[in-house]
Interface confidence: medium
């Protein structure tokens, strides 16, 4: 377990360095801003479980090693363009649902044993966000999510691998947007 944690922490220091700006931007802009709907909220404890956090990051690492397309980023600043802080959890809910339904479930036989442990965890987060909605028009959010979906679809199986490789970013973005 100590080796696993060491491996994850070195991975965080290395691979995740590239996403620090995105995550810092989210935090600086007030990641815990009050959502429009009180249902767009996840308890902090969901993100404070060392084992499943490690498994999520290990899964992302494993998939990113199989991802040859380093030019494309799915979860980045473009995804949040024009989306207010209070709407970001709702946006991440859409991304999470797409990732589960179109990527993780169909790819469930790959990247064992991590996939088998991470998918139920993410499915439970999705379930907890099932009543998360926003007031008014969400077209700007759907447009951003659609671009992500189109990118994954266009890349085919390698797009699915990329999405799995970015589960660390999905995890962090969910945490920053929804707690």
């Amino acid at each position: 377990m100590a080796a696993l944690q060491k491996s994850v922490s070195s991975f965080l220091m290395g691979t995740l360095a590239t996403s620090c700006l995105l995550l810092l931007a989210l935090l600086v802009q007030g990641g815990a801003a009050a959502p429009i709907s009180s249902h767009c909220r996840l308890d902090k404890s969901n993100f404070q479980q060392p084992y499943i956090t490690n498994r999520t990051f290990m899964l992302a690492k494993e998939a990113s090693l199989a991802d040859n397309n380093t030019d494309v980023r799915l979860i980045g600043e473009k995804l949040f363009h024009g989306v207010s802080m209070s709407e970001r959890c709702y946006l991440m809910k859409q991304v999470l649902n797409f990732t589960l339904e179109e990527v993780l479930f169909p790819q469930s036989d790959r990247f064992q044993p991590y996939m088998q442990e991470v998918v139920p965890f993410l499915a439970r987060l999705s379930n907890r966000l099932s009543t998360c909605h926003i007031e008014g028009d969400d077209l700007h959010i759907q447009r951003n999510v659609q671009k992500l979906k189109d990118t994954v679809k266009k890349l085919g199986e390698s797009g699915e691998i990329k999405a799995i490789g970015e589960l660390d970013l999905l995890f962090m973005s969910l945490r920053n947007a929804c707690i």
Epitope: F105, E117, P120
Partner: antibody, heavy 117, light 107 residues
């Protein structure tokens, strides 16, 4: 509640084909794997294959590849198992079942396929 | 594909007895799931992810284990528990495999 209702029993001659249907209700059909599992009389459970209706992705047991086709029609929430070149040894109860994480929580009532000359 | 071997293949026990079934995998798996099947009925899931009881399943059923060795236990056998029990895994790509089954009879 989740329900899987299968088509009725079939009696076929060796060499013939059969298509068994599995109508799903009570959940989002496209979002869960549907498995087909068979059980010869008095024997254990044998996995045939699975389909993810959302994308149409299928996986098969190598043992049955070439003789089996699994498909799904999202518009009517129905999965199908088509079996060609039937043999007497294919006589079995055929079950469709829905995944629950990595287990199989919901089962159809089974369709008995009898292959006999 | 990963092979699952259950033991015993059958057993006879009295009401109130503690019953244990083991399932051994030919290589390491993440989780084991356990099913019950009564004559003329479809199988039903009892335990998923090695030790989690499906909602509505009596607490006398339990599961444990890791790696290649897993155990299913009925703490106090009841007459209605007469059935065949199967273990199942979904770790190997892309196979699902079942154990050959353990038939439990009431003395």
């Amino acid at each position: 509640q989740v329900q899987l209702v299968q088509s009725g029993a079939e009696v076929k001659k060796p060499g013939a084909s059969v298509k068994v249907s599995c109508k799903a209700s009570g959940y989002i059909f496209r979002s869960y794997w549907i498995h087909w599992i068979r059980q010869p009389p008095g024997k254990g459970l044998e996995w045939i294959g699975r389909i993810y209706p959302g994308t149409g992705r299928t996986y098969y047991n190598e043992k049955f590849k070439g003789r089996v086709t699994i498909s799904a029609d999202k518009s009517i929430s129905t999965a199908y198992l088509q079996w060609s070149s039937l043999k007497a040894s294919d006589t079995a109860m055929y079950y469709c079942a829905r995944s629950y994480d990595y287990s199989v929580a919901y089962w159809g009532q089974g369709t008995l396929v009898t292959v006999s000359s | 594909a990963i092979q699952l071997t259950q033991s015993p293949s059958s057993l006879s026990a009295s009401v109130g007895d503690r019953v244990t079934i083991t399932c051994s995998a030919s290589s390491s798996v993440s989780y084991m799931h356990w099913y019950l099947q009564k004559p003329g009925q479809s199988p039903q899931l009892l335990i998923y992810e090695t030790s989690k009881l499906l909602s509505g399943v009596p607490s006398r059923f339990s599961g444990s284990g890791s790696g290649t060795d897993f155990t299913f236990t009925i703490s106090s056998l009841e007459a209605e528990d007469a059935a065949t029990y199967y273990c199942q895994q979904w770790s190997s790509n892309p196979y699902i495999t079942f154990g050959q089954g353990t038939k439990v009879e009431i003395k």
